[in-house]
């Protein structure tokens, strides 16, 4: 014998209290597959979370983070504070990248500038807190007759480490 509940489509549930007829999911609940005996409560985008996609009778709500935060975790289960470019997030909040490191995003950690000399190249444009260095051709390639390159930005004082 076929289970009568198997005929209940997504967006409904098989209601045991009403001779296993297919009843629509109540408000704020959903069933994403057929043959369900209950509908699930929708995820609630509350507090730091805001609704990206409303719940429907056949699909769950989707959340993202309020401005100033970005999603972490599966399905945006957490929100992490944004920082400015040139900063990284620490336990005590946003901190400027130390000299010799950069971050060109609002999230993530400060990363060391590229070491151009490892590739036998010269620094074409100095790095900043927000941008990596730009490596140019190797010093040997810069013959006296070669076309000029963009002058590097003024370097910061060695050892300067803003906090």
């Amino acid at each position: 014998l076929q289970d009568p509940c198997s005929n209940c489509p997504a967006g409904t549930f098989c209601d045991n209290n009403r001779n296993q007829i297919c009843s629509p999911c109540p408000p704020n609940s959903f069933s994403s597959a057929g043959g369900q005996r209950t509908c699930d409560i929708c995820r609630q985008c509350k507090g730091v979370f805001r609704t990206r996609k409303e719940c429907s009778s056949t699909s769950n709500a989707e959340c993202d983070c309020t401005p100033g935060f970005h999603c972490l975790g599966a399905g945006c289960s957490m929100c992490e504070q944004d920082c400015k470019q040139g900063q990284e997030l620490t336990k005590k909040g946003c901190k400027d990248c130390c000299f010799g490191t950069f971050n060109d995003q609002k999230r993530g950690i400060c990363r060391p500038w590229t070491n151009c000399s490892l590739d036998g190249k010269s620094v074409l444009v100095n790095g900043t807190k927000e941008r990596d260095v730009v490596c140019g051709p190797s010093p040997a390639d810069l013959s006296p007759g070669a076309s000029s390159v963009t002058p590097p930005a003024p370097a910061r004082e060695p050892g300067h480490s803003p906090q």
């Epitope: 699930d40 507090g47 975790g73 399905g75 289960s77 929100c79 504070q81």
Partner: antibody, heavy 123, light 106 residues
Framework: EVQLVESGGGLVQPGGSLRLSCAAS??????????VGWIRQAPGKCLEWLAL???????YYSPSLKSRLTISRDNSKNTLYLQLNSLRAEDTAVYYC???????????????WGQGTLVTVSS | DIQLTQSPSSLSASVGDRVTITCRAS??????LAWYQQKPGKAPKLLIY???NLETGVPSRFSGSGSGTDFTLTISSLQPEDFATYYC????????FGCGTKVEIK
């Protein structure tokens, strides 16, 4: 350092009301993303979430207690409040104030708790 | 409402034991689950958030796993200071707590 200090507990008559306070320090109740709520624990019983208010002043209540609860805050005093009306013996509990999320990652958990304030409902 | 059922409600264990506590949700809640430790007369202390993330300062012998409806808190090697009551809490829809698992000395 984040600190939450509850006050306002004590002996209350059945049918009466109480207003609990939670003084917050080390963060602002109006900082984006922050939510602060109330959780209680009757003697020897489970933890029960009651209410939460977020930085945008959105309020959330336990469905079973919604009609008797009011959560509010005073940003100038950085203080959270809970009003509970029509008190019954079963409202006797330690009432905790707790902040949602951790330091830089915020979600639906409570990383910081006050020490609690005991409310006894008895005639 | 979403209910959380913890098991066992209490257990006896010895120092050095591996302890596992389970929390079952009445429906799928993704990874929106936290674990707390509470000692008598004290406020709960957050151990694990988002099912498996260890809160800063919590010893690495504590770990959390699971998603959907079934979650586990594991203490890999029980220490004297770990005898306490442990609670799970969901934040998928409003907030609810399990009723606790008391870990006692055998």
């Amino acid at each position: 350092e984040v600190q939450l200090v509850e006050s306002g507990g004590g002996l209350v008559q059945p049918g009466g009301s109480l207003r609990l306070s939670c003084a917050a320090s080390g963060f602002s109740l109006s900082t984006g993303g922050v939510g602060v709520g109330w959780i209680r624990q009757a003697p020897g019983k489970c933890l029960e979430w009651l209410a939460l208010i977020d930085w945008a002043d959105d309020k959330y209540y336990s469905p079973s207690l919604k009609s008797r609860l009011t959560i509010s805050r005073d940003n100038s005093k950085n203080t959270l409040y809970l009003q509970l009306n029509s008190l019954r013996a079963e409202d006797t509990a330690v009432y905790y104030c707790a902040r949602g999320g951790s330091d830089t990652v915020i979600g639906d958990w409570f990383a910081y708790w006050g020490q609690g304030t005991l409310v006894t409902v008895s005639s | 409402d979403i209910q959380l059922t913890q098991s066992p409600s209490s257990l006896s264990a010895s120092v050095g034991d591996r302890v596992t506590i389970t929390c079952r949700a009445s429906q799928s809640i993704g990874s929106y689950l936290a674990w707390y430790q509470q000692k008598p007369g004290k406020a709960p202390k957050l151990l694990i958030y988002d099912a498996s993330n260890l809160e800063t300062g919590v010893p690495s012998r504590f770990s959390g796993s699971g998603s959907g409806t079934d979650f586990t808190l594991t203490i890999s090697s029980l220490q004297p200071e770990d005898f306490a009551t442990y609670y799970c809490q969901q934040g998928y829809y409003l907030w609810t707590f399990g009723c606790g698992t008391k870990v006692e000395i055998k």
